[in-house]
């Protein structure tokens, strides 16, 4: 068990803060909830603190919850590939460029680390080149979320990881908006981290609303499990 992994044996409170600017539309989001890495489970509620969110909530899911990949469930035989927990409590910097097909792009940078007993994901997001009446600024996405695989590989030069995946957002007219994600994680501290073999995270997310919440918001339930590395030969012959 890595030192950081010991911090995730129970339920951990999570705080998310996002400051964003998309095509000059400025906004802020606050989120809180909890994570349980034993089950790879996240429950979070996000509120736009500046009024109405200028972009559809689903476009921010990866920035919020795929940001705290330290809550992914890594099976016993894969624990030595869990970069995310090994970087704790000092945490990691997570940078992404997200290209929305035939539309604009988001650039994000986040620091994910423990502040006391709380896991904090503090994010900044800049969006440019979006069409005013496109799927994103025109709010044409359905309020739901598909399952995805998130592909992880070690980046030995930077003592971190590189992550690639493609998100499929459902559009109201029945078509799909693709969002290509290019991600890089580097540790904040200088302690040892686990550099993984290639593998993937399997994610399932459910979006809902709080019937008692008047502000623009999103409620998120998510399950994430690591996969893609088989048991070693010694395991097979037991």
């Amino acid at each position: 068990m890595s030192k950081g992994e010991e911090l995730f044996t129970g339920v951990v409170p999570i705080l998310v803060e996002l400051d964003g600017d998309v095509n000059g539309h400025k906004f802020s989001v606050s989120g809180e909830g909890e994570g349980d890495a034993t089950y790879g489970k996240l429950t979070l509620k996000f509120i736009c603190t500046t009024g109405k969110l200028p972009v559809p909530w689903p476009t921010l899911v990866t920035t919020f919850s795929y940001g705290v990949q330290c809550f992914s469930r890594y099976p016993d035989h894969m624990k030595q590939h869990d970069f995310f927990k090994s970087a704790m409590p000092e945490g990691y910097v997570q940078e992404r460029t997200i290209f929305f097909k035939d539309d604009g792009n988001y650039k994000t940078r986040a620091e994910v680390k423990f502040e006391g007993d709380t896991l904090v994901n503090r994010i900044e997001l800049k969006g440019i080149d979006f069409k005013e009446d496109g799927n994103i600024l025109g709010h044409k996405l359905e309020y739901n979320y598909n399952s995805h695989n998130v592909y992880i590989m070690a980046d030995k030069q930077k003592n971190g990881i590189k992550v690639n995946f493609k998100i499929r957002h459902n559009i109201e007219d029945g078509s799909v908006q693709l969002a290509d994600h290019y991600q890089q994680n580097t540790p904040i501290g200088d302690g040892p981290v686990l550099l993984p073999d290639n593998h993937y995270l399997s994610t399932q997310s459910a979006l809902s609303k709080d019937p008692n919440e008047k502000r623009d918001h999103m409620v998120l339930l998510e399950f994430v499990t690591a996969a893609g590395i088989t048991h070693g030969m010694d395991e097979l012959y037991k």
Partner: nanobody, 121 residues
């Protein structure tokens, strides 16, 4: 990293911070020309994604930061004589309201010692 340059040229200023975790601070560049008031040039959010520029430098200057190395930079291109001034880097803790508060020029309360930039025609 100040200095003298001909109009149309480029310069890069750097500022090294110490004694605080830069990733929790807004950073900014200011300048003061002889006989004029100090004016804001550019601000940058704690994680370096959200920038803001004075109209007079938009499209010519680019602010960036490297939190791992605790440095702030200002790349100045297409310089004009009106850019001649003493340039200062400045910092302030991330406001309670978040990174959007970094654009408040008057709130900056930690200052570097300044470097002279001279642009001749």
């Amino acid at each position: 990293g100040g200095g003298s340059v001909q109009a149309g040229g480029s310069l890069r200023l750097s500022c090294a911070a110490s004694g605080f975790a830069m990733s929790t601070y807004c950073m900014a560049w200011f300048r003061q020309a002889p006989g004029k008031e100090r004016e804001g040039v550019a601000t940058l959010s704690p994680l370096g994604i959200l920038s803001h520029y004075a109209d007079s430098v938009k499209g010519r200057f680019t602010v960036s930061r490297d939190n791992a190395k605790n440095t702030l930079s200002l790349q100045m291109n297409s310089l004009i004589p009106e850019d001649t001034a003493m340039y200062y880097c400045a910092a302030m803790p991330r406001p309670d309201g978040g990174a959007h508060g970094c654009v408040s020029w008057l709130a900056y309360n930690f200052w570097g010692q300044g470097t002279q930039v001279t642009v001749s025609s």
